[in-house]
Interface confidence: low
């Protein structure tokens, strides 16, 4: 999906109002210095592309992020403010919607959410620079 035509201000508002709180709650008990940010993005559409990938595409060591509340809110936000965005374009649709019972949060998942927080912060900073 091409995120170029999204309403970035609305997405930022939704992130600051709710998604960020859920990401921080998920990370509670860990220090921001526990993980190094290895994923970055260069502009707003690129940031959303990376955010979608990290949020919805299961990885071998962290397969369950898509059912978390922050992921559900991210999905709703993208669908609302990105014209033509379709849930069927998310590779992890099945994993996301089935909401299998949550397993204990693994260190690898915490690392992935830490990366997500970094991408969202980058998205906000990029937004500020563009205005």
């Amino acid at each position: 999906y091409d995120f170029t035509n999204c309403d970035f201000q609305k997405i930022e508002a939704d992130y600051l109002r709710t998604i960020s709180k859920d990401l921080i709650t998920y990370m509670s008990g860990t220090k921001s210095t526990d993980f190094n940010n290895t994923v970055s993005c260069s502009n707003r559409p690129h940031c959303l592309t990376e955010i979608q990938s990290l949020t919805f595409n299961p990885t071998p060591r962290c397969a369950s992020l898509a059912k978390e509340m922050f992921a559900r809110k991210t999905k709703a936000t993208l669908a609302l403010w990105c014209p033509g965005y379709s849930e069927t374009q998310i590779n992890a649709t099945q994993a996301m919607k089935k909401r299998r019972k949550r397993k204990v949060t693994t260190n690898k998942c915490l690392e992935q959410v830490s990366q997500l927080l970094g991408l969202w912060r980058r998205f906000i900073r990029t937004l500020l620079k563009k205005q």
Epitope: K10, T18, M69, R72, K73, K75, A76, A79, L80, G84, Y85, S86, E87, T88, T93, Q94, K97, K98, R99
Partner: antibody
Framework: QMQLVESGGGVVQPGRSLRLSCAAS????????MHWVRQAPGKGLEWVAV????????HYADSVKGRFTITRDNSKNTLNLQMNSLRAEDTAVYYC???????????????WGQGTMVTVSS | SYVLTQPPSVSVAPGQTARITCGGN??????VHWYQQKPGQAPVLVVY???DRPSWIPERFSGSNSGNTATLTISRGEAGDEADYYC???????????FGGGTKLTVL
């Protein structure tokens, strides 16, 4: 307990207007997406409209677009449906329904009101 | 727009298993929700997200979803299960909530 109570139904002539209300209690209304769903006599359920938890987004079924307006007053825990240019085919029981999570669209409807009957007839 | 197709009626003998289907193009990629509606009453959510059950719904109610068909299964059918059942999805391409036409379940 969690409850939704609709009001404002009645008999109205074609072309006229009617305003439905839905009073919510027992839950934090401002954090939930809300919908209107209707059911014509002897027919199935038809989704009508949705409003985002903070009122920033609304969306309508094609059959009512441009005629109906969904609003909410979070300070009063109230959902409204302003129905203008009513037609005979709008005759139905109108239910308000809550989405159980922050996302007003993606979730199922876990709480429904008892419904209010709207009859459009000359 | 997206269309959900349900059989108008399904019958089941007491104690037996009833299966109500909901057909839609690639419905397996969507989250399907099911409602029970008894005459003169508001609908009640019985299954959400394909197979999850609200806490107030008995385990006899279950759901599945893959390919082009979602299914609501009611095991050990009882007279109290007689009702209309509706499936529902959100169609992301149109941002519309879509209901199936409903299925009348009769417990013989």
């Amino acid at each position: 307990q969690m409850q939704l109570v609709e009001s404002g139904g009645g008999v109205v002539q074609p072309g006229r207007s009617l305003r439905l209300s839905c009073a919510a209690s027992g839950f934090t209304f401002r954090t939930y997406g809300m919908h209107w769903v209707r059911q014509a006599p002897g027919k199935g359920l038809e989704w009508v409209a949705v409003i985002w938890y903070d009122g920033s987004y609304t969306h309508y079924a094609d059959s009512v677009k441009g005629r109906f307006t969904i609003t909410r007053d979070n300070s009063k825990n109230t959902l409204n449906l302003q129905m203008n240019s009513l037609r005979a085919e709008d005759t139905a029981v109108y239910y308000c329904a809550r989405s159980p999570q922050w996302e007003s669209i993606f979730e199922a409807f876990d709480i429904w009101g008892q419904g209010t009957m709207v009859t459009v007839s000359s | 727009s997206y269309v959900l197709t349900q059989p108008p009626s399904v019958s089941v003998a007491p104690g037996q298993t009833a299966r109500i289907t909901c057909g839609g193009n690639n419905i397996g990629s969507k989250s399907v929700h099911w409602y029970q509606q008894k005459p003169g009453q508001a609908p009640v959510l019985v299954v959400y997200d394909d197979s999850d059950r609200p806490s107030w719904i008995p385990e006899r109610f279950s759901g599945s979803n893959s390919g082009n068909t979602a299914t609501l299964t009611i095991s050990r059918g009882e007279a109290g299960d007689e009702a209309d059942y509706y499936c529902q999805v959100w169609d992301s391409s149109s941002s519309l909530v879509v209901f199936g036409g409903g299925t009348k379940l009769t417990v013989l």
